[in-house]
């Protein structure tokens, strides 16, 4: 699986999850998030050669098409597969609110 | 929606579904498919600016991060959203077989 455990160890050049630390204030301008100050959102990148973690029959077909027709610009793309939530603390006036934001952390990638 | 109806009419530069005709024999080397000879598989391409058909909270966050940090190479990617099957005819010896291949045709795209 193209997950953090594999990708962060092996630094694979093809489609893999990459670490990306996002500081809410500095990187997004979100001053309203009190805690955490930032988090590892991660992202997916890298080429998707034929059959690499193909998501659907279409991505398999497109990968083969791209291999046999390399001048074509049609190829699968490396995108998130498994995502996890992030719990944040923010304030409404002086009242603290805890909320779980879904799909905030990329744990693995696929070629789609 | 970034579907064939919209994208094939407007020729949008940002993330959209693009027409792609694949000839089974010529483009894939698949001589075993008897009918159809080819089909419109289509594919997704184009930049994913902030908030364009964002798939998850993560793609929204990543789109904003990329807008504010354009030198970073971390941005969402344009990939298939809705796919449809394709029915094919092939032969096993002299026996005709009809099979429905799932997820063969891209009908719309999203930024993931």
């Amino acid at each position: 699986a193209l997950d953090t455990n594999y990708c962060f160890r092996n630094l694979e050049e093809n489609c893999c999850v990459r670490p990306l630390y996002i500081d809410f204030r500095q990187d997004l301008g979100w001053k309203w998030v009190h805690e955490p100050k930032g988090y590892y959102a991660n992202f997916c990148s890298g080429p998707c050669p034929y059959l690499r973690s193909a998501d659907t029959t279409h991505s398999t077909v497109l990968g083969l098409y791209n291999t046999l027709n390399p001048e074509a610009s049609a190829s699968p793309c490396c995108v998130p597969q498994d995502l996890e939530p992030l719990t944040i603390l923010y304030y409404v006036g002086r009242t603290p609110k805890v909320e779980q934001l879904s799909n905030m952390v990329v744990k693995s990638c696929k070629c789609s | 929606a970034l579907d064939t109806n919209y994208c094939f009419r407007n020729l949008e530069e940002n993330c959209c579904v693009r027409p792609l005709y694949i000839d089974f024999r010529q483009d894939l080397g698949w001589k075993w498919v008897h009918e159809p000879k080819g089909y419109y598989a289509n594919f997704c391409s184009g930049p994913c600016p902030y908030l364009r058909s964002a798939d998850t909270t993560h793609s929204t966050v990543l789109g904003l991060y990329n807008t504010l940090n354009p030198e970073a190479s971390a941005s969402p990617c344009c990939v298939p959203q809705d796919l449809e099957p394709l029915t094919i005819l092939y032969y096993v010896g002299r026996t005709p077989k009809v099979e429905q291949l799932s997820n063969m045709v891209v009908k719309s795209c999203k930024c993931s």
């Epitope: 953090t4 092996n10 630094l11 990459r18 670490p19 990148s45 | 970073a72 190479s73």
Partner: nanobody, 119 residues
Framework: QLQLVESGGGLVQPGGSLTLSCAAS????????MSWVRQAPGKGLEWVSV????????IYSDSVKGRFAIARDNAKNTLYLQMNSLKPEDTAVYYC????????????RGQGTQVTVSS
């Protein structure tokens, strides 16, 4: 909050050696790859090296390959860069970076440490 503190820079003669250190805190250091980047006077950030989370995979830019060695001590939350056969063109401010700086450019969190190679 994620913090990175670089140290070990200084003035060294061509052909000399230095070892840079980076103390990391505010995140699970052992889970993530780490990188070194540098910024020469009047130039942009240049990726130097990256090391995998367990220290097994190490990749170097062509400009430092064979001269620099990246290492990490996950027990101490510390990243290192052993710099040998230093050249004047290695003069720069060196920063450690969380993650793999081949993919995410233009972002430094620490103050950096100045390395000057001059006779």
């Amino acid at each position: 909050q994620l913090q990175l503190v670089e140290s070990g820079g200084g003035l060294v003669q061509p052909g000399g050696s230095l070892t840079l250190s980076c103390a990391a805190s505010g995140f699970t250091f052992s889970h993530y790859p780490m990188s070194w980047v540098r910024q020469a006077p009047g130039k942009g950030l240049e990726w130097v090296s990256v090391i995998g989370s367990d220290g097994g995979t190490k990749i170097y830019s062509d400009s430092v390959k064979g001269r620099f060695a990246i290492a990490r001590d996950n027990a101490k939350n510390t990243l290192y860069l052993q710099m040998n056969s230093l050249k004047p063109e290695d003069t720069a401010v060196y920063y450690c970076a969380e993650g793999d700086s081949r993919y995410v450019r233009g972002r430094t969190r620490g103050q950096g440490t100045q390395v000057t190679v001059s006779s």
